[in-house]
């Protein structure tokens, strides 16, 4: 009778230890459950020791000892006869024989289904000589068995031109069905048909498939693997799996969730990253995408001033990177900002609105109608101007900066004066006579210094000149400031 060793039984001593290349270093026992890493511990079958020779192919040596006693017949010891194991597991089996030391150059070869196994296998023959006999143990290991490893394995030993053959060791690679294709998670449009595929193989074959939806079988009659399930459409999320059955039992695939695409949830946590006078950088956390990738987002901006006309500015942007710089805003203004994003199904609701403010900026225009004239009696230059329009001040005026440059006979000197925000005139002392004074004025806010006005020049005569007239910025369209003396 064939001795059979199944994975769930221990008919022979089992030697533990994973095959090299596995992640294990602790060499756990063979018959433990499969490891999370996917490594299957090996089945290893020892020679029976000391063991009883079988009565199969026996070589009866013709050599006699000194006392002329014939030597006992040589035969391989019995070992396991039939190994059934699952695909991808490791297995090791061996042949053992004790050979009198008078024999030299004994070699053992492994054969499978009548063909000698050469190379590409882990086969080792070990020799343990004693006083009179040498124990020879030939071990054959397969790290990860495949269906192609099924078959009958024997050892052959040539000795004295005789061939000793072991009993066969039958390797049967089989087990529960193994999935080659499992259903995949999908996001589908409501009430739209879709397909799921499941494929599993033995051995043993055939493998039959049952489909399961939300823990209930879909098909009463099994389908032969591979199986395609056509679902006419869903109105709500469902979980599908498939069961693969063969004579060894049942394997259940992973459960996959089929989701129904919907409009996204509104973005959350809209926040201000940075504010300048004319721009606001915002970020947001996208809401749930509704099982459909975001396509783009819309930033809605309203002036928060109750006197504003309530118009909404809309800025469209890509869905990534959840960051947008809103430009072309007014300085020192309050805005309400909301974000909405869309997927293939539609737009989300708008996020909760947040309030944001632009900062003060430097004025965007210079003071207007700059006029300069000489007050000779007091040896001063009087300067007058008009403040920039309120909308273009971009903040609260804190004053003005006056630049006056004095040029005479190749010498040039620039002086700066700061004046308060009240009023629109200033007086500066004459620095140099018989010289040209060039005046420019800029408005100042806490946001910075605005642009300087166009230069206005006035000639300061030597002492004793009487006639003078004011100098002023040119009317629009004139190329150069007018100099009147």
């Amino acid at each position: 009778a064939i001795t059979e060793a199944r994975e769930e039984a221990k008919p022979y001593p089992l030697f533990p230890g994973p095959f090299p290349g596995s992640l294990q270093t602790d060499h756990t026992p063979l018959l433990s459950l499969p490891h999370a890493s996917g490594y299957q511990p090996a089945l290893m079958f020892s020679p029976t020791q000391p063991g009883r020779p079988h009565t199969g192919n026996v070589a009866i040596p013709q050599v006699t000892s000194v006392e002329s006693k014939p030597l006992p017949p040589l035969a391989f010891k019995h070992t396991v006869g039939h190994i059934i194991l699952s695909e991808h597991k490791g297995v090791k089996f061996n042949c053992s024989i004790s050979v009198p030391n008078i024999y030299q150059d004994t070699t053992i070869s492994w054969w499978k289904d009548g063909k000698e196994l050469l190379g590409a296998h882990h086969a080792i023959t070990q020799f343990y000589p004693d006083d009179e006999v040498t124990a020879i143990i030939a071990s054959f290991s397969i790290t990860s068995v495949q269906r192609s490893d099924n078959g009958s394995y024997i050892c052959k030993m040539k000795i004295n031109n005789e061939e000793i053959v072991s009993d066969p060791i039958y390797i049967e690679v089989q087990g529960l069905p193994h999935f080659t294709k499992q259903p995949e998670s999908m996001n589908v449009t409501r009430n739209t048909a879709f397909n799921l595929t499941c494929q599993a193989v033995g051995p043993p074959e055939p493998v039959n498939i049952f489909w399961v939806q939300n823990s209930s079988r879909v098909n009463e009659q099994p389908e032969k693997s591979p199986s395609v399930l056509t679902v006419p459409g869903l109105t709500e999320m469902a979980v599908f799996s498939c069961e693969a059955h063969n004579d060894k039992g049942l394997t259940v695939s992973k459960g996959v969730q089929i989701n129904i695409k919907a409009i996204p949830s509104p973005p959350t946590e809209v926040s201000i990253r940075n504010s300048t006078a004319h721009s606001i950088l915002i970020s947001w956390v996208p809401g749930f995408d509704g099982y459909s990738p975001f396509r783009n987002c819309s930033i809605q901006v309203k002036e928060a001033d109750p006197l504003s006309n309530g118009s909404v500015m809309i800025f469209n942007t890509s869905a990534l990177p959840h960051l947008y710089q809103i430009k072309q805003l007014q300085a020192l203004a309050n805005y309400s900002i909301g974000v909405s994003c869309m997927n293939e199904i539609g737009w989300s609701a708008v996020s909760p609105w947040i309030l944001a403010s632009t900062t003060e900026g430097a004025p965007s225009v210079a003071p207007l109608n700059v006029t300069v004239f000489l007050n000779e009696s007091s040896d001063n230059v009087d300067i007058r101007w008009m403040k920039p329009p309120t909308k273009q001040q971009d903040g609260e005026l804190v004053g003005y900066r006056i630049s006056h440059v004095w040029q005479s006979a190749g010498i040039s000197k620039e002086l700066l004066e700061e004046v308060g925000q009240n009023g629109s005139r200033a007086r500066i002392s004459v620095q140099v006579h018989n010289a040209t004074c060039t005046v420019r004025i800029a408005a100042v806010t806490r946001g910075g210094v605005g642009p300087f006005s166009d230069p206005v020049k006035i000639f300061i005569p030597a002492h004793g000149w009487v006639d003078y007239a004011p100098s002023s910025t040119p009317a629009p369209g004139n190329a150069d400031p007018v100099l009147i003396i």
Epitope: P16, G17, P29, Q49, H122, S139
Partner: antibody
């Protein structure tokens, strides 16, 4: 994980018997494998002494066979070495180790105990 | 018994050097050979088995080659922690070890 720990007297008189025990933890000796003893004389190389399996089956180094006994006690998860008629030449670090059985019956040694020094002196 | 002869018995090398140690068996042992590293006061640790298979967790700078009677252990770029004694061991028959090769700092 599997660990091995040698124990026994560090000093033995000439002609007496050296006795060491190796306690195995993190793994059951009954699960299989051969379990071996290796020694290393001061400043010298490594010498395999012998190995035993869970059933008590032994292999001994031909050069030490006449003086060595290795036994196993699966109930205590330990195995032992006895080396009789010791001389100063037996002074060495003695290591216990598991003989892996990945390829054959007795392959390489992994892991090893940390070793214990035994001095033979009167 | 199968004897293993290692050469050289010692060598001096610098960090970054390529180091080669050989092990010769007195008779053919196929690929039934392992290499160990031993540091002072410590037990040997397996580096290579089956003549050329790298033990899990051993740096890839270690490699083994050979079959039959001649075997080689190579350290491609010696690191400070590699200064130690290296042994070969055959498992074709009763285990025997080479006499060791000590790798010292030059």
């Amino acid at each position: 994980q599997l660990q091995l720990q040698e124990s026994g007297p560090g000093l033995v008189k000439p002609s007496e018997t050296l006795s060491l025990t190796c306690a195995v933890s993190g793994y059951s000796i009954s699960s299989g494998n051969y379990w071996g003893w290796i020694r290393q004389s001061p400043g010298k190389g490594l010498e395999w002494i012998g190995s035993v399996d869970h059933s008590g089956s032994t292999y001994y180094s031909p050069s030490l066979k006449s003086r060595v006994t290795i036994s196993v006690d699966t109930s205590k998860n330990q195995f032992s070495l006895k080396l009789n008629s010791v001389t100063a030449a037996d002074t060495a670090d003695y290591y216990c180790a598991r003989n892996t059985m990945i390829r054959g019956v007795m392959d390489w040694f992994d892991p090893w105990g940390q070793g214990t020094l035994v001095t033979v002196s009167s | 018994a199968i004897q293993l002869t290692q050469s050289p018995s010692s060598l001096s090398a610098s960090v970054g050097d390529r180091v080669t140690i050989t092990c010769r068996a007195s008779q053919g042992i196929s690929s039934a050979l392992a290499w160990y590293q031993q540091k002072p006061g410590k037990a040997p640790k397996v580096l290579i088995y089956d003549a050329s298979s790298l033990e899990s967790g051993v740096p890839s700078r270690f490699s083994g080659s050979g079959s039959g009677t001649d075997f080689t252990l190579t350290i491609s770029s010696l690191q400070p922690e590699d200064f130690a004694t290296y042994y070969c061991q055959q498992f074709r028959s009763y285990p025997t070890f080479g006499q060791g090769t000590k790798v010292e700092i030059k």
